[in-house]
């Protein structure tokens, strides 16, 4: 369970892949599409508001009562819209929603090598946001083999301005 209804911190950042392609968001036919693309030099990177929450592990392996906490994140590129996992379609979508946000909007943050991060679905452990055919998709990761899979690694670049939502 999320231990608090308020995030412990928020940051405004641009999101890019391990291979330095930008994650961009475009309004098309009254819905948002998510793209993974090489940005032209003069084009500004899209901003994402990342809100970080603490969450206790759901159950204990050892039964000793202290199970550690996870860092959860929600990602919002524009006001009232959040990235959400669609586990049935194995897709990542932008949906307009009100708080409290659904579980599909929460991702467990993993730090990775090369100072990248990965986003694991709260609703489907072992499934991560990844890059597939120039789009974001949900990718099942075999923990024993693919912990460093480049297609689930992302870089966050801080945008130093006030953490107000960008409209």
């Amino acid at each position: 369970s999320i231990t608090g209804i308020s995030p412990i911190t928020e940051s405004l950042a641009s999101l890019s892949t391990y291979n330095d392609q930008s994650i961009t968001f475009a309004l098309e036919d009254e819905s948002y599409e998510i793209y993974v693309e090489d940005l032209k030099k003069d084009k500004k990177k899209d901003k994402v508001l990342l809100s970080y929450y603490e969450s206790q592990h759901p159950s204990s392996e050892s039964g000793d009562g202290v199970d550690g906490k996870m860092l959860m994140v929600t990602l919002s590129p524009t006001k009232d819209f959040w990235l959400q996992a669609n586990n049935k379609e194995h897709s990542v979508e932008l949906h307009k929603c009100e708080k409290p946000l659904p579980d599909q909007a929460f991702f467990v943050l993993h730090n990775r090598s090369f100072n990248c991060v990965s986003f694991e679905c709260k609703t489907d452990p072992g499934v991560f946001i990844g890059v597939k055919d120039n789009h974001l998709a949900l990718i099942k990761v075999d923990y024993s083999e693919n912990l460093g899979s480049e297609n689930i690694l992302f870089k966050l670049s801080e945008i130093l301005e006030h953490h107000h939502h960008h409209h």
Epitope: I8, E61, V66, G68, L109, N111, R112, N115, L147
Partner: antibody, heavy 122, light 107 residues
Framework: EVQLVESGGNLEQPGGSLRLSCTAS????????MNWVRRAPGKGLEWVSG????????YYADSVKGRFTISRDNSKNTLYLQMNSLSAEDTAAYYC???????????????WGHGTTVTVSS | DIQMTQSPSSVSASVGDRVTITCRAS??????LAWYQQKPGKAPKLLIY???SLQSGVPSRFSGSGSGTDFTLTISSLQPEDFAIYYC?????????FGQGTRLEIK
């Protein structure tokens, strides 16, 4: 009670080797990313190495890369630091420390052992 | 590597004083900064994480603020047990790096 207990510190000659151990209790060790941090006499804290909960990912400070190896045995709730090619600059109190978050180092280190002393001198 | 610079390196203060320690990162680290207290012969103790979150069990006289590159630890009213060395630590990226420490001494 959440606890980390280090052992293995000793007086060692330059060029020698030591293996430090850290035994954990009171929390789910296999979920927790762990670290070694040292403090040399009269100096500040220096992060030495880190390892993910599964042991699949390891990280090192440049000052120890190629000489030190971090590892863990989750069945024994124990963290290790194998230290080779020791020099006087490695003289320090060595602490093991648990990451606050199970999958992220963003939260700092919330549980620390009491430390074990390594002295490298001829 | 990210360099962390603390100031002052030492400070003398009296019980009841308000004390502020600053920490500057050589590049932006979002809010991923932790503060520790260490007393002689003891292990470091986590006080603040994520720049401003108070670790469980730590007295509320300790507070943290800042984001990006500039951070502050404030002790609102010094108590006798607060005299120690304080370290900042960037938790944004490996290698993890600490500030050089600030020694808080009794005036």
């Amino acid at each position: 009670e959440v606890q980390l207990v280090e052992s293995g510190g000793n007086l060692e000659q330059p060029g020698g080797s030591l293996r430090l151990s850290c035994t954990a209790s009171g929390f789910t060790f296999s979920r927790s990313a762990m670290n070694w941090v040292r403090r040399a006499p009269g100096k500040g804290l220096e992060w030495v190495s880190g390892i993910s909960g599964s042991g699949g990912r390891t990280y090192y400070a440049d000052s120890v890369k190629g000489r030190f190896t971090i590892s863990r045995d989750n069945s024994k709730n124990t963290l290790y630091l194998q230290m080779n090619s020791l020099s006087a600059e490695d003289t320090a109190a060595y602490y093991c420390a648990k990451d606050s978050y199970t999958t992220s180092w963003y939260g700092g280190m919330d549980v620390w052992g009491h430390g074990t002393t390594v002295t490298v001198s001829s | 590597d990210i360099q962390m610079t603390q100031s002052p390196s030492s400070v003398s203060a009296s019980v009841g004083d308000r004390v502020t320690i600053t920490c500057r990162a050589s590049q932006g680290i979002f809010s991923w900064l932790a503060w520790y207290q260490q007393k002689p012969g003891k292990a470091p103790k986590l006080l603040i994480y994520a720049a401003s979150s108070l670790q469980s069990g730590v007295p509320s006289r300790f507070s943290g603020s800042g984001s990006g590159t500039d951070f502050t630890l404030t002790i609102s009213s010094l108590q006798p047990e607060d005299f120690a060395i304080y370290y900042c630590q960037q938790a944004n990226s490996v290698p993890i790096t600490f500030g050089q420490g600030t020694r808080l001494e009794i005036k």
